[in-house]
């Protein structure tokens, strides 16, 4: 899987989407995960809702809010008031049980506001 | 109508290939997964593994890697299981399954039987 | 990989009466977080393919009669089969799919006394 790398400017709103076939993960949930290390457990930061058919619905964990649309097959994660300690790299997962399936590998990137001090 | 219908019996040789087949009709296919399940004489089932034909996505019993493969062509709405190099203990009657993204199976074919005898 | 143990291995019921199968298994299949048990009943009938009759614990299968019923939590399941006919008999099967490799009990086979 290619990784893709999205940026975002420190303080602000980072939306990151990722796309699936929604026929191949029907009844499936979602998860929002940060890759500990190269090689380490992707550690859960939130997941959609326990019934998949309120996925729709905004789930929140922190600043982090996850929301997954199963007609088009897009879940769609919002990392608010973006923090340098939010930079790394994370994974949209399809979850069946206990088994995740990776849907893509995003790299997250926070750029300080030149304007600050 | 949905239909699985699988290749007939073989009789083979140790050491011989084999690719037996399922064809699904009557629903999407590739938008489906598909199981193989094996049923050795007498005894229980095993899944084997499962494919979905959309874009041949695979995965396998660690018990099954490496000894069969799992394919699939969407053009002809068919999905296969084969084996390089037969042994006797691949003797069994093979099932084709019709699997939800959350793995369980709802359509099952009528059963391939495969004996392996020199 | 987590091991189905069903029980009995057989089954001899009279028609009419209540028929219970047992499926134990070595992990919990209760998800935590979605609150699903994911755990699915098969019947095989003599000389057939099998046919799902419940999943996800205790969901009927399309055209399944209601005199099936699953039951159970976390490591321990019940299959049971109410007023049962002569069409009922065949091997029954639990199977695990919370995660691979799916794995299923060795089968509980029921037959007419």
């Known amino acids: 899987l290619n990784t893709t790398v999205l940026q975002g400017m420190a303080g602000q709103s980072l939306r990151v989407s990722c796309t699936y076939d929604a026929l191949k993960h029907w009844g499936r949930r979602k998860a929002w995960c940060r890759q500990l290390g190269e090689e380490g457990p992707c550690q859960r930061v939130v997941s959609t809702h326990g019934v998949w058919l309120l996925a729709f619905l905004k789930k929140r964990n922190g600043s982090t809010v996850i929301a997954d649309d199963t007609l088009a097959g897009t879940v769609t994660i919002t990392l608010k008031n973006l923090q340098a300690g939010d930079a790394g790299l994370y994974q949209c997962q399809s979850l069946r049980g206990r088994e995740a399936e990776v849907l893509q590998k995003v790299l997250v990137e926070v750029l300080e506001d030149p304007l600050d001090d | 109508e949905v239909q699985l219908v699988q290749s007939g019996s073989e009789v083979k040789k140790p050491g011989e290939s084999l690719r037996i087949s399922c064809k699904g009709s009557?629903?999407?296919?590739?938008?489906?997964?598909l199981a193989w399940v094996r049923q050795m004489p007498g005894k229980g089932l095993e899944w084997m593994g499962i494919?979905?034909?959309?874009?041949?996505?695979?995965r396998y019993s660690p018990s099954f890697q490496g000894q069969v493969t799992i394919s699939a062509d969407k053009s002809i709405s068919t999905a296969y299981l084969q084996w390089s190099s037969l042994k006797a203990s691949d003797t069994a009657m093979y099932y084709c399954?019709?699997?939800?993204?959350?793995?369980?199976?709802?359509?099952w074919g009528q059963g391939t039987l495969v004996t392996v005898s020199s | 990989d987590i091991v189905m143990t069903q029980t009995p291995l057989s089954l001899p019921v009279t028609p009419g009466e209540t028929a219970s199968i047992s499926c134990r298994s070595s992990?919990?299949?209760?998800?935590?977080?979605?609150?699903?048990?994911?755990l699915d009943w098969y019947l095989q009938k003599p000389g057939q393919s099998p046919q799902l009759l419940i999943y996800?614990?205790?969901y009927r299968a399309s055209g399944v009669p209601d005199r099936f019923s699953g039951s159970g939590s976390g490591t321990d399941f019940t299959l049971k089969i109410s007023r049962v006919e002569a069409e009922d008999v065949g091997v029954y099967y639990c199977?695990?799919?919370?995660?691979?490799?799916?794995?299923f009990g060795g089968g509980t086979k029921v037959e007419i006394k």
């Open positions: 494919i979905y034909p959309g874009d041949s996505d695979t």
């Open positions: 992990q919990s299949l209760l998800d935590s977080e979605d609150g699903n048990t994911y």
């Open positions: 996800t614990l205790s």
């Open positions: 009557g629903y999407s296919f590739s938008s489906y997964w």
């Open positions: 399954a019709r699997g939800t993204p959350l793995f369980y199976f709802t359509y």
């Open positions: 199977m695990q799919r919370i995660e691979s490799p799916l794995t």
